[in-house]
């Protein structure tokens, strides 16, 4: 293959591969907890946004989908499933509803929502 | 790697790989002819929509972007850059403007536009 071309992955079959991360958009609506469980069952996690550059494909995502960001009421911070804190200036967080979970919306927006509301979701698997 | 996982590609560096097709969304606005030239310079073509199943990632694309579909006034058909005719029921063609070129819009819509209008564009490379 040409030097300018490369393989991406490995990823679960029929997932999107971009800059060696794997993504899948799930069409069925689940609450945040069910969405998290679905991703975990596929050795993945809900979407984690860590870089506007490495994840610029997310700019053009239509609609809004559960991601792995949750509000920790005790200290008021937003953190990812892996326990890391949301970096400043990565997401524009907008309170659409009183809640402790967040939907990913295009152009790096995070919509605060009630965790029990059903929504579509994005799973992500980082390749090693 | 697990049997359920696989590599995707090969694709140009930092392109999106999905079901062994390569896609890139270009942010700068160009007219249809300039967009075509830009894709060709990268050994690719403007987006060709050939399968709702193999290209279901296109459902979730926000906004609208030049694709490789042009109107042939002599016979009234729509055809791709490679000369193949648009398959029926693949795209909902909507006349936004008098024109002979088409923009891809989410959920498999094609917006007819004047070819000289600048828009963002999608390049595609099919892997062998």
């Amino acid at each position: 293959i040409p030097l300018t071309e490369s393989y991406c992955g490995p990823c679960p079959k029929n997932w999107i591969c971009y800059k060696n991360n794997c993504y899948q958009f799930f069409n069925e609506s689940k609450n945040w907890y069910e969405s998290q469980a679905s991703c975990m069952s596929q050795n993945a996690s809900l979407l984690k946004v860590y870089s506007k550059e490495d994840q610029d494909l997310l700019k053009l995502v239509k609609s809004y989908h559960w991601m792995g960001l949750v509000h920790i009421p005790t200290n008021g911070s937003w953190q990812w499933e892996d326990g890391s804190i949301l970096s400043p200036n990565l997401l524009t967080i907008i309170e659409m509803q009183k809640g402790d979970c967040a939907l990913y919306a295009s152009s790096f927006k995070g919509y605060i929502e009630n965790c029990s509301i059903p929504n579509t979701y994005i799973c992500m698997q980082r390749t090693v | 790697i697990p049997l359920t996982e696989s590599y995707c590609g090969p694709c140009p560096k930092n392109w999106i790989c999905y079901k062994n097709n390569c896609y890139q969304f270009f942010n700068e606005s160009k007219n249809w002819y300039e967009s075509q030239a830009s894709c060709m310079s990268q050994n690719a073509s403007l987006l060709k929509v050939y399968s709702k199943e193999d290209q279901d990632l296109l459902k979730l694309v926000k906004s609208y972007h030049w694709m490789g579909l042009v109107h042939i006034p002599t016979n009234g058909s729509w055809q791709w850059e490679d000369g193949s005719i648009l398959s029926p029921n693949l795209l909902t063609i909507i006349e936004m403007q008098k024109g002979d070129c088409a923009l891809y819009a989410s959920s498999f819509k094609g917006y007819i536009e004047n070819c000289s209008i600048p828009n963002t564009y999608i390049c595609m490379q099919r892997t062998v």
Epitope: S29, I94, M96, K109, I117, P118 | -
Partner: antibody, heavy 115, light 108 residues
Framework: QVHLQESGPGLVKPSETLSLTCTVS????????WSWIRQPPGKGLEWIGH???????NYNPSLKSRVTISVDTSKNQFSLKLSSVTAADTAVYYC?????????WGQGTMVTVSS | EIVLTQSPGTLSLSPGERATLSCRAS???????LAWYQQKPGQAPRLLIY???SRATGIPDRFSGSGSGTDFTLTISRLEPEDFAVYYC?????????FGQGTKVEIK
């Protein structure tokens, strides 16, 4: 491009319920949050509330006890109900989508509350 | 709720002049969650600026937004005849979302 069209009665009697519907021109009902905003004659704009395609609604506390916003994804429509109306509810009512802000608006429908 | 106060109430200017519109919030608007809209008589408002400074699609570059915290500004660098209208600011940093009372830009 998304187009929005409000519909409903232009005249409502005091103490009755105002009902409006907003029809979305394409299949984008599941792509955005959908809002209602009103503007009394010669005055400014007031956000009433919004709803997601899954039915999660948020209302302006000043109207919360009287307002219900619902969505019907199968018809590409969302609706506003405002109960126990008075003359103070006379306004142009707009529907709008929320993306980066209120990006796309309907043309508005004038509702007069009068007996 | 956050109260937005716009000034001046009316701005009388000639085409080609620069217009500066102010929007002051009663408390800090988090992360510059402020939008500007233009409304002409008998029409719906049109989004001009979001995120305090980002121009909406199709908005000419003579429109610019700036500011943070409690003080925001919409600037029209050279007024065109079609720019004479009422302008509203709106915050979406905290619920309920609120609008300013508007500034009318009229022909002098």
């Amino acid at each position: 491009q998304v187009h929005l069209q409000e519909s409903g009665p232009g005249l409502v009697k005091p103490s009755e319920t105002l009902s409006l519907t907003c029809t979305v021109s394409d299949d984008s009902i599941s792509s955005y949050y959908w809002s209602w905003i009103r503007q009394p004659p010669g005055k400014g704009l007031e956000w009433i509330g919004h709803i997601s395609y899954s039915g999660s609604a948020n209302y302006n506390p000043s109207l919360k006890s009287r307002v219900t916003i619902s969505v019907d994804t199968s018809k590409n429509q969302f609706s506003l109900k405002l109960s126990s109306v008075t003359a103070a509810d006379t306004a142009v009512y707009y529907c709008a989508n929320w993306d980066d802000a209120f990006n796309i608006w309907g043309q508005g429908t004038m509702v007069t509350v009068s007996s | 709720e956050i109260v937005l106060t716009q000034s001046p109430g009316t701005l009388s200017l000639s085409p080609g002049e620069r217009a500066t519109l102010s929007c002051r919030a009663s408390q800090s608007v988090s992360s510059s969650y402020l939008a500007w809209y233009q409304q002409k008589p008998g029409q719906a408002p049109r989004l001009l600026i979001y995120g305090a400074s980002s121009r909406a699609t199709g908005i000419p570059d003579r429109f610019s937004g700036s500011g943070s915290g409690t003080d925001f500004t919409l600037t029209i660098s050279r007024l065109e005849p079609e720019d004479f209208a009422v302008y509203y600011c709106q915050q979406y940093g905290s619920s309920p979302w609120t609008f300013g009372q508007g500034t009318k830009v009229e022909i002098k």
